[in-house]
Interface confidence: low
């Protein structure tokens, strides 16, 4: 097998256990609503768009524990009792029962518009992630990257996109320079809760998208 | 529609350089990672160079490390793969690829995730 050797930071290695690492003839999954005529798919079917959305989200997660680790190892962040104090400063997207993203009560329009929604909300934080990170550099920057890509194929999945709302520019300008306005404590609390509300809200999601 | 087109390949002498372009369309640059592979006649495909979105780690197969340099130009929606001190054995068509995400792949071992598009291809012949 011919390895790739790495240079600049260390591989971006979100280690997903359904990936199929073939030296030879690499399968050829194609994203929801693009043809791909050229590229054949010698070992097995092309991904379906649900397929394919599932394996974004595993994909991000694994990135967000990456990042988690790197937080967790360079504060006491991830013991603290503190949470709430700083929580209460935090706007982050929550999956609530009239989301219709829970078993009881589940409704697919409404929930996918939520996802969108909360996963368009989360690119303030995510952004905020950026620079927050040493060894880790490339993995906040997947991650980010990973949800507008997660994103796009939410709305190609979704029906009502009107009823999508877009977060205003403006106030995230003005939230991100909030928050980057922190002392350095505040900055690794919410740096640790943007991270676990993030997972948190991508598991909810995961469950949701499976239903549908 | 998502495009990958490949250009620069040639006829060169060993120990010539070349520099192939992977010019994509269609999507943004930025969000995938972007592969070089090369099928030579009667061999198995092999995965040359990788480099992932936005801050672009490089990967490299043994073969061609020190030898071959890959680069992206986001702004031009184009990848490149510059390639030194050519010998016969690196003669093949080389083809670019978009991964399915935004790395390499697991550990940098081959382009392992899913690639979702790939180029024609253009032909690197290296003889004397």
């Known amino acids: 097998m011919n390895s790739f050797s790495t240079s600049a930071f260390g591989p971006v290695a979100f280690s997903l256990g359904l990936l199929l690492v073939l030296p030879a003839a690499f399968p050829a999954p194609v994203p929801p609503g693009e043809d791909s005529k050229d590229v054949a798919a010698p070992h097995r079917q092309p991904l379906t768009s649900s397929e394919r959305i599932d394996k974004q989200i595993r994909y991000i997660l694994d990135g967000i524990s990456a990042l988690r680790k790197e937080t967790c190892n360079k504060s006491n962040m991830c013991e603290s009792s503190k949470e709430a104090l700083a929580e209460n400063n935090l706007n982050l997207p929550k999956m609530a029962e009239k989301d219709g993203c829970f078993q009881s009560g589940f409704n697919e329009e409404t929930c996918l518009v939520k996802i969108i929604t909360g996963l368009l909300e989360f690119e303030v934080y995510l952004e905020y992630l950026q620079n927050r990170f040493e060894s880790s550099e490339e993995q906040a920057r997947a991650v980010q990257m990973s949800t507008k890509v997660l994103i796009q194929f939410l709305q190609k999945k979704a029906k009502n996109l009107d009823a999508i709302t877009t977060p205003d520019p403006t106030t995230n300008a003005s939230l991100l320079t909030k928050l980057q306005a922190q002392n350095q404590w505040l900055q690794d609390m919410t740096t640790h809760l943007i991270l676990r509300s993030f997972k948190e809200f991508l598991q909810s999601s995961l469950r949701a998208l499976r239903q549908m | 529609e998502v495009q990958l087109v490949e250009s620069g390949g040639g006829v060169v002498q060993p120990g010539g350089s070349l520099r192939l372009s992977c010019a994509a369309s269609?999507?943004?640059?930025?969000?995938?990672?972007i592969g070089w592979f090369r099928q030579a006649p009667g061999k198995e495909r092999e995965g040359v160079s990788c480099?992932?979105?936005?801050?672009?780690?490089?990967y490299y197969a043994d073969s061609v490390k020190g030898r071959f340099t890959i680069s992206r130009d986001n702004a031009k929606n184009t990848v490149y793969l510059q390639m030194n001190s050519l010998r016969p054995e690196d003669t093949a068509l080389y083809y670019c690829?978009?991964?399915?995400?935004?790395?390499?792949?697991?550990?940098?071992?081959?382009?392992?995730?899913?690639?979702?598009?790939r180029g024609q291809g253009t032909l690197v012949t290296v003889s004397s």
């Open positions: 690829v978009r991964s399915s995400w935004f790395d390499c792949g697991v550990q940098g071992r081959d382009l392992g995730n899913e690639y979702d598009y």
């Open positions: 269609g999507f943004t640059l930025a969000y995938y990672a």
């Open positions: 480099i992932s979105g936005s801050v672009g780690t490089t």
